[in-house]
Interface confidence: medium
Amino acid sequence: MEQRGQNAPAASGARKRHGPGPREARGARPGPRVPKTLVLVVAAVLLLVSAESALITQQDLAPQQRAAPQQKRSSPSEGLCPPGHHISEDGRDCISCKYGQDYSTHWNDLLFCLRCTRCDSGEVELSPCTTTRNTVCQCEEGTFREEDSPEMCRKCRTGCPRGMVKVGDCTPWSDIECVHKESGTKHSGEVPAVEETVTSSPGTPASPCSLSGIIIGVTVAAVVLIVAVFVCKSLLWKKVLPYLKGICSGGGGDPERVDRSSQRPGAEDNVLNEIVSILQPTQVPEQEMEVQEPAEPTGVNMLSPGESEHLLEPAEAERSQRRRLLVPANEGDPTETLRQCFDDFADLVPFDSWEPLMRKLGLMDNEIKVAKAEAAGHRDTLYTMLIKWVNKTGRDASVHTLLDALETLGERLAKQKIEDHLLSSGKFMYLEGNADSAMS
């Protein structure tokens, strides 16, 4: 019996589900909105997606690159086959997709892999189709694809009409942008005749140096500056002062960068790591670090047991006072994105913690029973329970609520994995702020 696909629908009427699927140039973009639920969902999904994509699998390599003969069949896990495979007619085997011909992006129970997209004439192939990822096509230089006409690439205009100036170049996603000289209002309609032609080089794909880009840049810089000043002035600063020696006074350190670097920190980085850890909500105790698989670099800092012990020194008071919030990097809708991530949580949260976690999140025993009965299979159970939680809690369901519940249960490793995945996938980023004021 099929209860759902891998990720079931979110709220009714919702249109796009932004899951870990093929990112082609033709997709629509969700509008900006950053509720806390988004943070939670995105975090979860991203976690898994980047874990999958961080490792170069045999299927991702072209046939001539493969080190050993490809295993064509394996057994399904919980009735699902991994990315790069589809399920056999009898449901007993997972069969590999054919490189360059078809693909599957996620755990699935499809009888056929999806056919690879062929780039149209007028498009360039940004990345080829592998068994786990569809072809990514992009308009050639000098042309663009609008959301209104996703089927074809259109030629960019060569210049702006009289009385207007060019503020945005031609990119594969947009025509040149023109604004009125005096008012600075954007021109969106078609240009009848180009008189005072301001030529644009059709090259420079995706050069985001438009007026809006500058405004956004300045705004972001201002916010960063305010946050930096706040950090430097806060009580936390007093604790950190002996170590910082000039990060806030122009020493140029970048704790975020160190935090997410893929190398093991050297001795000279330890002080900086300690500082960063004070600002972080999540620390991983020694014994859990040892259990963690020493993955290849995935954008997450690996600490030695000694170092991780050292990171635990800051008191709980500091932790509650300063908290680094996970916010979606793409400004998508939190609730929508959250739902899409649930499918991956089953792989990150130990099975015996599923029910305690859901109780902690506020589901009643009866609701948990109903969810278990509705679930299509074992792996589906956590997904179904989380959906119930979001339906019940609405906008109050957030990434942080979920992460805090895991922390309370002592599932710090699961919490860390989810956070790391969200960050390394690029879907989430840290926002510094007060724990109580910024949780929205």
Partner: nanobody, 116 residues
Framework: EVQLVESGGGLVQPGGSLRLSCAAS????????IGWVRRAPGKGEELVAR????????RYADSVKGRFTISADTSKNTAYLQMNSLRAEDTAVYYC?????????WGQGTLVTVSS
């Protein structure tokens, strides 16, 4: 812009029939699976049927096997769900969705009410 628009829902008596349509735009249905998912009041989502228009492969939930038929007309870029022998428990909002091993785009849904 990718869009899925459902139509054909309504009120029907038990044992009656309805045909739902799902008009897709912004992508070619031949390139994906198309599924019909329903959400009944107080129940979870159920994937009732899906089709891979490229080769006509279909699959159904046990609860609708033999009663529902999913089909697609690739020339019209439209998928259909023919629902026969309808029961009260088929009452739900039916969504058409694009399926890439998980559903990424959804329609707004069409309400099907089976009641005497």
């Amino acid at each position: 812009e990718v869009q899925l628009v459902e139509s054909g829902g309504g009120l029907v008596q038990p044992g009656g029939s309805l045909r739902l349509s799902c008009a897709a735009s912004g992508f070619n249905i031949k390139d994906t699976y198309i599924g019909w998912v329903r959400r009944a009041p107080g129940k979870g989502e159920e994937l009732v049927a899906r089709i891979y228009p490229t080769n006509g492969y279909t699959r159904y939930a046990d609860s609708v096997k033999g009663r529902f038929t999913i089909s697609a007309d690739t020339s019209k870029n439209t998928a259909y769900l023919q629902m026969n022998s309808l029961r009260a428990e088929d009452t739900a909002v039916y969504y058409c969705a694009r399926y890439w091993s998980y559903f990424d785009y959804w329609g707004q849904g069409t309400l099907v009410t089976v009641s005497s």
